[in-house]
């Protein structure tokens, strides 16, 4: 059998491999050792017994989308049946005091691979034996502690495979410089040690995306905006736009990044090298926000101009691809996809990212101020309570609701929250009466709200001890 027979449904073409050469990966035309690594089709009854106590689930994730030329990282995590975990030695053990369907296990081990390798590893002194090999026959790399790595992961994409020895979690990074743009499929097959051979325990696949557009996300924040996710904001208050570039492999770390903004309100283009920008809309309405991000990223060098035509044709390269990141020689000789590399040449290519949003601008409460606090006369039967009137003004639209949150002096521990509808005149002047139980210092957060906005002001007030002989206290 060949790798593509085992790992995929259809034989990938050489064209696919040639156009997506992954550094350090091998062609899936290579032979697969079926004696050591048996192949089971979906639905084969043997899957039922491939793991003690249930089925192992493999979870494959990636940090896709990846900007072409950057690295994309795939992570595989194995999820064992209930009550099972991997210990420090790479053995699979039952968790203490954990009950599964079979009850508590007397044997602490699900798989004790350490004991097996110590007892029965008939090796020739070199630490290498005929069974410590990958499906294509390559020997396991002898990293420190490799004997505690009991899972073999075979990654397969674009007609190529990559083999990795690992524990219950592995990561593989792939450079995408030569990967065709668009969605691609990564498939992973996982085997476990089983005596002097291996047993398949899980298969998983996931789609990843390679793009030549910088993946851009923009967060928008505005003070007093009630719902930051509805793309409705308030007139006459600055909106803070923060650009997040998805670049987990830090491919653009050394790039100068330019941000070109068009806010859609006839204020022209704004160009910046800062990822945050503030903009205030002064009219109500719907506006089309456009952002273009430009970065000079490492990239292939353009082909040299064709030389003047010689009288006798000279051989030239089928492909001109000067890669910024690899000194690995390309296929040699008469391969139709020979790669030319100039190691010292560092070429750059402009990459762009785009973000577009439709923003609605409406009236909102822009500001709220407490202009006066007045003690209210209380009858003597309630000596512990104080009533205080807060006289509040606001700017912008007319509020429909007022809330007061009374807390401790640090403003962290809420003691009391009261919200009530309000009916305010055009001047936006209102009085809010609140009760304070006992003397002391209080933090008062007062918010005025309407459908789209929520404006806040805070103050610390000090309520003095109540003197029964003086029913009235002066205003603060």
């Amino acid at each position: 059998k060949r790798f593509h027979d085992v790992l995929g449904n259809e034989r990938p073409s050489a064209y696919m491999r040639e156009h997506n050469q992954l550094n350090g990966w091998s062609s899936d035309e290579n032979d697969w050792n079926e004696k050591l690594y048996p192949v089971w089709k979906r639905g084969d009854m043997r899957w039922k017994n491939s793991w003690k106590g249930g089925r192992v689930q493999a979870v494959l994730t990636s940090d896709s989308p990846a900007l072409v030329g950057s690295n994309i990282t795939f992570a595989v995590n194995l999820i064992f049946p209930r009550c099972q975990k991997e210990d420090a030695n790479g053995n699979i053990v039952y968790e203490k005091n954990c009950r599964n369907e079979a009850g508590l296990s007397a044997d602490p081990y699900v798989y004790n691979w350490t004991a097996w390798s110590e007892d029965s590893d008939g090796e020739n002194g070199t630490g290498q034996s005929h069974h410590n090999v990958f499906p294509d026959g390559k020997p396991f790399p002898h990293h420190p502690g490799w004997r505690r790595w009991n899972f073999i992961y075979v990654f397969h994409t674009l007609g190529q495979y990559f083999q990795k020895l690992g524990r219950c979690s592995v990561r593989v990074s792939v450079n995408t410089a030569n990967v065709t743009l668009g969605p691609q499929l990564m498939e992973v097959t996982v085997y476990r040690r089983h005596g002097r051979a291996y047993v398949p325990i899980a298969q998983v696949k996931d789609v990843y995306v390679v793009t030549d557009q910088i993946p851009v996300f923009v967060t928008m924040f505005q003070k007093n905006d009630r719902n930051s996710s509805d793309e409705t904001f308030l007139k006459d208050l600055p909106i803070m736009f923060d650009v997040l570039i998805h670049d987990p492999s830090h491919f653009l770390n050394y790039s100068t990044i330019n941000y070109k903004w068009s806010f859609g309100d006839n204020t022209g283009l704004f160009v910046s090298t800062n990822h945050t920008v503030n903009h205030t809309y002064v009219l109500n309405g719907t506006f089309s926000l456009n952002l273009t991000v430009k970065a000079a990223a490492p990239g292939p060098c353009p082909p040299p101009p064709p030389p003047p035509r010689p009288s006798k044709p000279t051989p030239s390269l089928a492909t001109t691809l000067k890669s910024y990141d690899s000194n690995t020689p390309g296929p040699a000789g008469d391969n139709p996809l020979e790669l030319s590399r100039i190691p010292d040449e560092n070429c750059q290519i402009n990459r762009y990212g785009h973000f577009q949003a439709t923003i609605t601008i409406v009236e909102g409460i822009l500001e709220v101020n407490i202009i006066q606090m007045t003690d209210v006369l209380m009858p003597v039967p309630w000596p512990e309570s104080s009533l205080i009137d807060f006289v509040v003004t606001c700017q912008g639209s007319i509020p429909t609701e007022v809330c007061t949150i009374i807390s401790d002096p640090t403003c962290e521990i809420t003691q009391n929250t009261v919200c009530s509808p309000v009916d305010v005149d055009e001047m936006c002047l209102l009085t809010v009466r609140r009760t304070f139980n006992g003397s002391g210092t209080y933090c008062v957060n007062l918010t005025l709200g309407d459908d789209t906005s929520l404006a806040l002001t805070s103050t610390l007030i000090s309520v003095p001890d109540r003197d029964p002989a003086s029913p009235l206290r002066m205003a603060n």
């Epitope: 064209y15 065709t180 292939p300 001109t320 691809l321 139709p336």
Partner: antibody, heavy 119, light 107 residues
Amino acid sequence: QVQLQQPGAELVKPGASVKLSCRASGYTFTSYWLHWVKQRPGQGLEWIGEINPSDGRTNYIEKVKTKATLTVDKSSSTAYMQLSSLTSEDSAVYYCARSGGNYAWFAYWGQGTLVTVSA
Amino acid sequence: DIVMTQSHKFMSTSVGDRVSITCKASQDVSPSVAWYQQRPGQSPKLLIYSASYRYTGVPDRFTGSGSGTDFTFTISSVQAEDLAVYYCQQHYSIPLTFGAGTKLELK
């Protein structure tokens, strides 16, 4: 919908050069390799080469490497094939065609440009 | 280079007939073979890709089969509009190559 637009015809003198264009629309230009195919009058189809619009990588058949040069202009989503030192052997219809991602079959073809090399 | 050989340059048929066109590759290209139809004065049109997959919108009277080096394109019931030249193409490796074409004509 996907379209590849090519001019109908070019008349050129022997020894001269010609630059054929193929304007793409209806898809993300940089996401697919573009290919050029030659068809001499009454003859079959012959693949000439391909270009990756994203980064300019190219592949050619051996015999046209000194004859054809493939380029792209991303800003106008246009691919070009320059043919130099033209002879009567180069008189043909030249098609541009788009491949299907990682697969080199052609679901989309231009109408073709008839190049006539004549004194 | 991979050579694609279409053994018949011409094939005579009648409307309603079943007709099969063969294509032989000089090496194993399975399953990377496509079939195109070209009517006079028109661009080629993709019918089948990866040996047996019918392209979107292609009538189901057109089918493809084969593996390894031998591939067959079949029209189950020829219609008048099917009279054209049919080309096989290997999309297995560069340089991409076409067969010489088979012209389907009326008896």
